[in-house]
């Protein structure tokens, strides 16, 4: 029951997270005009990954797409790529996890297959969440760098009394949506991996050995001790996990792919 709940919750949390990652990627407010120096501007600028917008006091909003690939900063391209990879992995993860759900019966699918699928989707959600967090963090870092650079030369003198104010940008709503969504996807992925441990069938190479004691026979089975120490009295139905060496190996080999995060 706890395994089903953990798996179900992991799926729902990941679903919300991936929906958030998609929303953040599509949002226009990745960076918004900093109003500290001019809180009463009649023109408000904000930018997304795909277009930049201007909202005027008149209520008119004008957005322009970035109709170039080569002319865009490499960092922006990297952020786009990270977000898209995150969405794709997340979507595949969702698809896999639907079939892996314990509450859904598909033909005569083995529990071991469901466990593998749960683990696969969990890892996909973890990578998806990390991609989103990395993408948003790279963009945030880019904003911070640009913010302080533009602060250093806030006013560019144009002779005499004339001033031209450089527009500074600060964190937009999409960044916070992205961070939260990435975190949720990551948590969902971890929950799926935890659920996988509970789904994995008992894998043992040992046969039950009978020892004959005087008067009555007691059967000792591997795992029987665990069953008798509060891990569940029904040893026949209980799947006891052996510590998960396989999963641990996968988890250990994973971070090396993403050392840059």
């Amino acid at each position: 029951m706890a395994v089903t709940a953990c798996q179900g919750l992991g799926f729902v949390v990941s679903l919300i997270g991936i929906a958030g990652i998609i929303a953040a990627t599509c949002m226009d407010q990745w960076s918004t005009q900093d109003l500290y120096n001019n809180p009463v501007t009649a023109v408000f600028n904000y930018q997304g990954l795909w277009r930049s917008c201007v909202r005027e006091s008149s209520g008119f909003t004008e957005c322009r797409g970035y109709f170039t690939l080569l002319g865009l900063p490499a960092m922006l391209q990297a952020v786009r790529a990270l977000m898209i990879v995150g969405i794709v992995l997340g979507a595949i993860g969702l698809l896999v996890s639907i079939f892996a759900l314990k509450c859904i019966r598909i033909g005569s699918m083995e529990d071991s297959a469901k466990a593998n699928m749960t683990l696969t989707s969990g890892i996909m959600f973890i990578v998806s969440g990390l991609c989103a967090i990395a993408g948003v963090s790279v963009f945030a870092n880019m904003l911070v760098t640009n913010f302080w650079m533009s602060t250093a030369n806030m006013y560019t003198g144009m002779g005499g009394m004339v001033q031209t104010v450089q527009t500074r940008y600060t964190f937009g709503a999409a960044l916070f949506v992205g961070w939260v969504a990435g975190g949720l996807t990551l948590i969902g992925g971890v929950m799926m991996c935890i659920a996988c441990r509970g789904l994995a069938p008992e894998e043992t190479n040992y046969k039950a050995v009978s020892y004959h004691a005087s008067g009555h026979s007691v059967a000792y089975k591997p795992g029987g001790f665990k069953a008798s120490t509060g891990f569940g009295s029904n040893t026949k139905n209980k799947k006891i996990y052996d510590g998960g060496a396989r999963t641990e190996d996968e988890v250990q080999s994973y971070p090396s792919k993403h050392d840059y995060v």
Epitope: A42, V43, R55, S58, G59, M158
Partner: antibody, heavy 120, light 113 residues
Framework: EVMLVESGGGLVKPGGSLKLSCAAS????????MSWVRQTPEKRLEWVAT????????YYLDSVKGRFTISIDNGKNTLYLQMSSLRSEDTALYYC?????????????WGQGTSVTVSS | DIVMTQSPSSLSVSAGQKVTMRCKSS????????????LAWYQQKLGQPPKLLIY???TRESGVPDRFSGSGSGTDFTLTITSVQAEDLAVYYC?????????FGAGTKLELK
């Protein structure tokens, strides 16, 4: 046809109050940002206040902040300017103006104005 | 606040003549987000409210004759009337539409010789 008709002006003593109204017709009133602009006896144009269509944000000229209040009644299609603690420098012809939606914040329609005289 | 300075304060011209008036702002009215200038030109005839002629520094408002044209960017702007007509006699104001307070210039009075 777009029409803006101001009313409520008159002669008032310094420190007194007055409420100006601007009845709008011929357009979807709640889709536009509205402003009050005054013209001094020296013919200088001075923006007074604006109420935006998005969020109903209000902006005021520093010299009228805390004394004037801009508001709208969408049901009546009317823009108001509540003026209190009036000073002699507030004497002017007060225009109600509509900010055009695609005119880069420029005011595309103006009323005929209502005169406010602050004098003892 | 952005200060708008108009020059000359008055112009005396003959009908058919080309006329140019200038407007200078203390701060750039060019928005980096869309590369548009937030400056408007108004015409005010005696006893009438101001009428919008040009917005965005160079876009003519609908119904405005094509003899009126606006140009300039950043801090320096120009209103040109290619062939002045008698009905063009008025006071012309420029306005900052970029930042509150939405300041106006003192105006340029166009008179007939």
């Amino acid at each position: 046809e777009v029409m803006l008709v101001e009313s409520g002006g008159g002669l008032v003593k310094p420190g007194g109050s007055l409420k100006l109204s601007c009845a709008a017709s011929g357009f979807t009133f709640n889709s536009y940002t509205m402003s009050w602009v005054r013209q001094t006896p020296e013919k200088r144009l001075e923006w007074v206040a604006t109420i935006t269509v998005i969020g109903g944000n209000t902006y005021y000229l520093d010299s009228v902040k805390g004394r004037f209040t801009i508001s709208i009644d969408n049901g009546k299609n009317t823009l108001y300017l509540q003026m209190s603690s009036l000073r002699s420098e507030d004497t002017a012809l007060y225009y109600c103006a509509r900010m055009g939606q695609t005119q880069r914040n420029a005011m595309d329609y103006w009323g005929q104005g209502t005169s406010v005289t602050v004098s003892s | 606040d952005i200060v708008m300075t108009q020059s000359p304060s008055s112009l005396s011209v003959s009908a058919g003549q080309k006329v140019t008036m200038r407007c200078k702002s203390s701060q750039s009215l060019l928005n980096s987000g869309n590369q548009k200038n937030y400056l408007a030109w108004y015409q005010q005839k005696l006893g009438q409210p101001p009428k919008l002629l040009i917005y965005g520094a160079s876009t003519r408002e609908s119904g405005v004759p094509d003899r009126f044209s606006g140009s300039g960017s950043g801090t320096d702007f120009t209103l040109t009337i290619t062939s002045v007509q008698a009905e063009d006699l008025a006071v012309y104001y420029c306005q900052n539409d970029y930042s509150f307070p939405l300041t106006f210039g003192a105006g340029t009075k166009l008179e007939l010789k």
